[in-house]
């Protein structure tokens, strides 16, 4: 495929990659696949500068990110190694609480009115935020 | 070459709504990542942020003044306008738009009016 | 709401180094950036996003954040670096200004 050298429109550049936020709500798989028909991923945070860029604009709202433990252990959507990565949990998250009575446990992670990070019931709708790299090639196949 | 200009009355009687247009060039209200802002500077005192309009409509204000105020924008006129409503003799200032995009921070600023409250 | 606290005031003799500190609760978590302003002139953005320089800054200027201060320095300062300085935060994606601190060339 292509290179991407520029963002698509209504994206936002930043350190050499593109993010898109959105303003309604969706549950996190429905939001991950939203992500995914864009040629992105839920945004993927591996550095403090890019936790304090994804704030800024998200506000105090909860996001959904590319975070989740739904098949065992935490895994970022894009490969990341969660173990060795970036963090911003609240204090005693993530605690995969089973009291909220909808079932289950917590096992997708987003971003609270403060920033830090929260694990949640994964059909909550909250606002999600798409990340792509750019100079990476799209998945689209070559014109010939 | 990005420019901006604020225009309106230079004297509000006090319980006035104040009205204020940001025209600019150089620049798209449409383009991700770009805002125009709203500060303010009383006479011999500090910058205050007043509002705050994104690319995306998103809309924020400083909490201490959110009930007094409303950010619009006409993307078609290249134009942003701040409504403040029960002007106070304390509201006295110079009043600036700016523009921002991403977290750069307010990097082009217009040249300021300044709006006098007095009855 | 949040606050940033800077010095009324700093003095500093021609070709030395003036420091002018921003501090705020967990200031370091945020974006911190910084204006000069001179009489009768708008603000100019002199850093953004803690330490970076606008094109036509000159590299005298720079600028850290951590912990709950951001400092903004300038060496081998000028006559012509007299002016008012503000640092300024993104809280909760809502901007706040520091009160200003004005720096005097001896």
């Known amino acids: 495929g292509s290179e991407r050298t520029c963002c698509p429109v209504n994206w936002v550049e930043h350190e050499r990659s593109c993010y898109w936020f959105s303003r309604s709500g969706k549950a996190w798989a429905d939001a991950d696949n939203y992500c995914r028909l864009e040629d992105a991923h839920l945004v993927v945070v591996t550095s403090w500068e890019e936790q304090k860029f994804v704030q800024h604009h998200i506000g105090p709202v909860n996001t959904w990110m590319g975070l989740h433990d739904q098949n065992g252990p935490w895994k970022w959507v894009d490969g990341t190694d969660y173990e060795t990565g970036f963090k911003n949990w609240r204090p005693e998250q993530p605690d995969d609480w089973y009291g909220h009575g909808l079932g289950g446990g917590e096992d997708c992670a987003h971003f609270t009115d403060d920033g830090r990070w929260n694990d949640d019931v994964c059909q909550r709708p909250y606002r999600w935020v798409c990340e792509t790299e750019l100079d990476k090639a799209s998945q689209e196949p070559p014109l010939l | 070459q990005i420019t901006l200009k604020e225009s309106g009355p230079t004297l509000v009687k006090p319980t006035q709504t104040l009205t204020l247009t940001c025209t600019f060039s150089?620049?798209?209200?449409?383009?991700?990542?770009?805002?125009v802002g709203w500060i303010r500077q009383p006479p011999g005192k500090a910058l205050e942020w007043l509002a705050l309009?994104?690319?995306?409509?998103?809309?924020r204000y400083s909490p201490s003044l959110k009930s007094r105020l409303t950010i619009t924008r006409d993307t078609s006129k290249n134009q942003v306008v701040l409504t403040m409503t029960n002007m106070d003799p304390v509201d006295t200032a110079t009043y600036y738009c700016a523009h921002t995009i991403a977290v750069r921070g307010f990097d082009y600023w217009g040249q300021g009016t300044l709006v006098t409250v007095s009855s | 709401s949040y606050e940033l606290t800077q010095p009324p005031s700093v003095s500093v003799s021609p070709g030395q180094t003036a420091s002018i500190t921003c501090s705020g609760d967990k200031l370091g978590e945020k974006y911190a950036c910084w204006y000069q302003q001179k009489p009768g002139q708008s603000p100019v953005l002199v850093i953004y996003?803690?330490?970076k320089r606008p094109s036509g800054i000159p590299e005298r200027y720079s600028g850290s954040n951590t912990g709950n201060t951001a400092t903004l320095t300038i060496s081998g300062t000028q006559a012509m670096d007299e002016a008012d300085y503000y640092c300024q935060a993104w809280d909760s994606s809502t901007a706040v200004f520091g009160g200003g601190t004005k720096l005097t060339v001896l």
């Open positions: 309009i994104y690319w995306n409509d998103d809309k």
């Open positions: 996003q803690d330490r």
């Open positions: 150089g620049f798209s209200l449409s383009t991700g990542g770009v805002g």
